[in-house]
């Protein structure tokens, strides 16, 4: 089980990396961080970390009320704070593993 | 009303350092990121530093890097700038500014205080 | 860095002229643009923010306009206390955020 969640935080952070060179990596973290309702993967700080994301922007699928450009120059009261691997590790946890 | 009121302004010899504030009141300060911008004596503004709203994000110009620090203390709603290692160059008038960031603009300034470097 | 290059630097007007400022961005902000106005002493007063949109309170004399790259900000009919430096701001790529120089506004 920590091996599998290992592995999914790595993926999850190797995806995000991807996130603005690939449009397909991005729409399927876009439904991740929509349908848990998260952002990042530790918590929406980690977008920031990605070199060829500017600093002030996150997906605007991290937004509570995606619309497009919510994402640029976003307000932390605007978007969903909690990190993607806890939320759909803890799903994981009681559905599949 | 609204009210960004900034203090700790001064007198400061080169090499020295100086902690303003901030005091806000009449809204929800969790609300907004916050930024510190100041103006030397008949030039333009400069963007100094901003901070979100949880304090998790902070950013600094090139210009204050690694001498400058900003802080918030969202049960005082209150904002901090510690400065030190000052230079001529920070002489300026430092505001404190609201920020609602997304598509709106920077729409509540204090009034200003004064840090002059000289020895 | 995104740079913001105003024009013109200053400006000589009178009572009732129509007046124009422009903005530049070294690349495509969109509509992130807002407008602020500073009188001497004082800090600077919000105007227009997302290029177009009039902040509450301020006068419809003012209007701002452009996408993109380019972007204006309109008097459309000038008061005595319209004389001030007005500035324009980029929030699209930060940080840093950056202004424009400034323009002054005098009276002719």
């Known amino acids: 089980r920590d091996k599998v969640m290992s592995e999914f935080n790595n993926n999850f952070r190797q995806q995000m990396e991807n996130y603005p060179k690939n449009n397909h990596t991005a729409s399927i973290l876009d439904r991740m961080q929509a349908d848990f309702k998260c952002c990042g993967a530790a918590n929406y700080t980690d977008w920031e970390k990605i070199p060829s994301m500017s600093k002030n922007r996150v997906p605007d699928s991290c937004c509570i009320n995606v619309t497009v450009g919510c994402g640029i120059n976003f307000n932390e009261k605007a978007i969903h704070k909690e990190g993607c691997v806890e939320k759909i590790g803890g799903w994981l946890r009681k559905n599949v593993l | 009303q609204v009210q960004l009121v900034e203090s700790g302004g001064g007198l400061v010899k080169p090499g020295g350092s100086l902690r303003l504030s901030c005091a806000t009141s009449?809204?929800?300060?969790?609300?907004?990121?916050m930024n510190w911008i100041r103006q030397a004596p008949g030039k333009g503004l400069e963007w100094v530093s901003y901070i979100s709203n949880s304090g998790s994000i902070r950013y600094y110009a090139d210009s204050v890097r690694g001498r400058f620090s900003i802080s918030r203390d969202n049960a005082k709603n209150s904002l901090y700038l510690q400065m030190s290692s000052l230079r001529a160059d920070d002489t300026a008038v430092y505001y404190c500014?609201?920020?609602?960031?997304?598509?709106?603009?920077?729409?509540?300034w204090g009034q200003g205080t004064t840090v002059t470097v000289s020895s | 860095d995104i740079q913001m290059t105003q024009s013109p630097s200053s400006l000589s007007a009178s009572v009732g002229d129509r007046v124009t400022i422009t903005c530049r961005a070294s690349q495509s902000i969109s509509s992130y643009l807002n407008w602020y106005q500073q009188k001497p002493g004082k800090a600077p007063k919000l105007l227009i923010y997302?290029?177009?949109s009039l902040q509450s309170g301020v006068p419809s004399r003012f209007s701002g306009s452009g996408s993109g790259t380019d972007f204006t900000l309109t008097i459309s009919s000038l008061q005595p206390e319209d004389f001030a430096t007005y500035y324009c701001?980029?929030?699209?790529?930060?940080?840093?955020?950056?202004f424009g120089q400034g323009t002054r506004l005098e009276i002719k």
């Open positions: 997302a290029a177009s």
């Open positions: 701001q980029q929030s699209y790529s930060t940080p840093p955020i950056t």
């Open positions: 500014v609201r920020d609602p960031r997304q598509i709106y603009g920077m729409d509540v």
């Open positions: 009449g809204f929800t300060f969790t609300d907004y990121f």
